[in-house]
Interface confidence: low
């Protein structure tokens, strides 16, 4: 392991479309990738009238924008679908929304997703 870097070996997995996609709905996903590539976790979710609906969570392939991010935080102001990525095992178990130039609105998980 490289000093100061959180190695990502597994992430929380969730798929809102698990029946159609023939996947598990939730679980722990081992992260695979080339040895010279970094691995991350991600979460995507929607905010429907204040109700958090997770779209998917899982492993994310090497992406410089996720480097050294220990927390999963979306900073975009009012996106259609929220997205964050991070490094470290299960770092996507909790995710937050802190829009830039706005009053912070943390959204923490665990969240109970609505049934599909």
């Amino acid at each position: 392991a490289i000093l100061g870097r959180s190695e990502t070996q597994e992430c929380l997995f969730f798929n809102a479309n698990w029946e159609r996609d023939r996947t598990n709905q939730t679980g722990v996903e081992p992260c695979y990738g080339d040895k010279d590539k970094r691995r991350h976790c991600f979460a995507t979710w929607k905010n429907i009238s204040g109700s958090i609906e997770i779209v998917k969570q899982g492993c994310w392939l090497d992406d410089i924008n996720c480097y050294d991010r220990t927390d999963c935080i979306e900073k975009k102001d009012s996106p259609e679908v929220y997205f964050c990525c991070c490094e470290g095992n299960m770092c996507n178990e909790k995710f937050s929304y802190f829009p830039e130039m706005e009053v912070t609105q943390p959204t923490s998980n665990p969240v109970t997703p609505k049934p599909p």
Partner: antibody
Framework: EVQLLESGGGLVQPGGSLRLSCAAS????????MNWVRQAPGKGLEWVAG????????SYADSVKGRFTISRDNSKNTLYLQMNSLRAEDTAVYYC?????????????WGQGTLVTVSS | DIQMTQSPSSLSASVGDRVTITCRAS??????VNWYQQKPGKAPKLVIY???SRASGVPSRFSGSGSGTDFTLTISSLQPEDFATYYC?????????FGGGTKVEIK
């Protein structure tokens, strides 16, 4: 009406530089991620680079990493692609394209393209 | 990177025919696939996004299906304006990658 208008293409020698621009109108430019996609003559589509809504995130295809730089000026509603150390294989029509989010949305609007020819 | 393999690379069909184009991803991309139509000398146009959703203004004869690794674009009754090249694209992970294209020609 959403409009994306590329400019800056032309003939350049190998090793040379070029800067492409994409002027956006008809939507709130600062709320959208933007991308460059290219198409070599008679070939398919290749994603070149992407940038998120405020320029905080960028990503590149391996084939251009270290040579091309994507940037944006939200005050001017303009997307840029700085291309250095150009090679013959960079010859293509370059399109700018919009996407609603950084990661998982389609390229819903495209410009008409600008041709870049790298030749001696 | 995720590879997108499209087939066939070209096909000949007549007006009114049902046309099916397939795309296979090198790993599961859930439903994160999009389809584009491109006519000669023109920019690509989004036809289907998120595997099954028709883009604004796209006729109902276009439909998309599939999830995971296998995806299909279907034109239920080919019209003269549908002769073009079609590309699939994954947006599950960066870098975004496209299939090689399918040219739909007049028989």
């Amino acid at each position: 009406e959403v409009q994306l208008l590329e400019s800056g293409g032309g003939l350049v020698q190998p090793g040379g530089s070029l800067r492409l621009s994409c002027a956006a109108s008809g939507f709130t430019f600062s709320s959208y991620s933007m991308n460059w996609v290219r198409q070599a003559p008679g070939k398919g589509l290749e994603w070149v680079a992407g940038i998120n809504y405020n320029g905080g995130y960028t990503s590149y295809a391996d084939s251009v990493k270290g040579r091309f730089t994507i940037s944006r000026d939200n005050s001017k509603n303009t997307l840029y692609l700085q291309m250095n150390s150009l090679r013959a294989e960079d010859t293509a029509v370059y399109y700018c394209a919009r996407s609603a989010n950084w990661h998982d949305t389609a390229l819903d609007y495209w410009g008409q393209g600008t041709l870049v020819t790298v030749s001696s | 990177d995720i590879q997108m393999t499209q087939s066939p690379s070209s096909l000949s069909a007549s007006v009114g025919d049902r046309v099916t184009i397939t795309c296979r991803a090198s790993q599961s991309i859930l439903s994160f696939v999009n389809w584009y139509q491109q006519k000669p000398g023109k920019a690509p146009k989004l036809v289907i996004y998120a595997a099954t959703s028709r883009a604004s203004g796209v006729p109902s004869r276009f439909s998309g299906s599939g999830s995971g690794t296998d995806f299909t674009l279907t034109i239920s009754s080919l019209q003269p304006e549908d002769f073009a090249t079609y590309y699939c694209q994954q947006s599950y992970n960066l870098p975004l990658t496209f299939g090689g294209g399918t040219k739909v020609e007049i028989k």
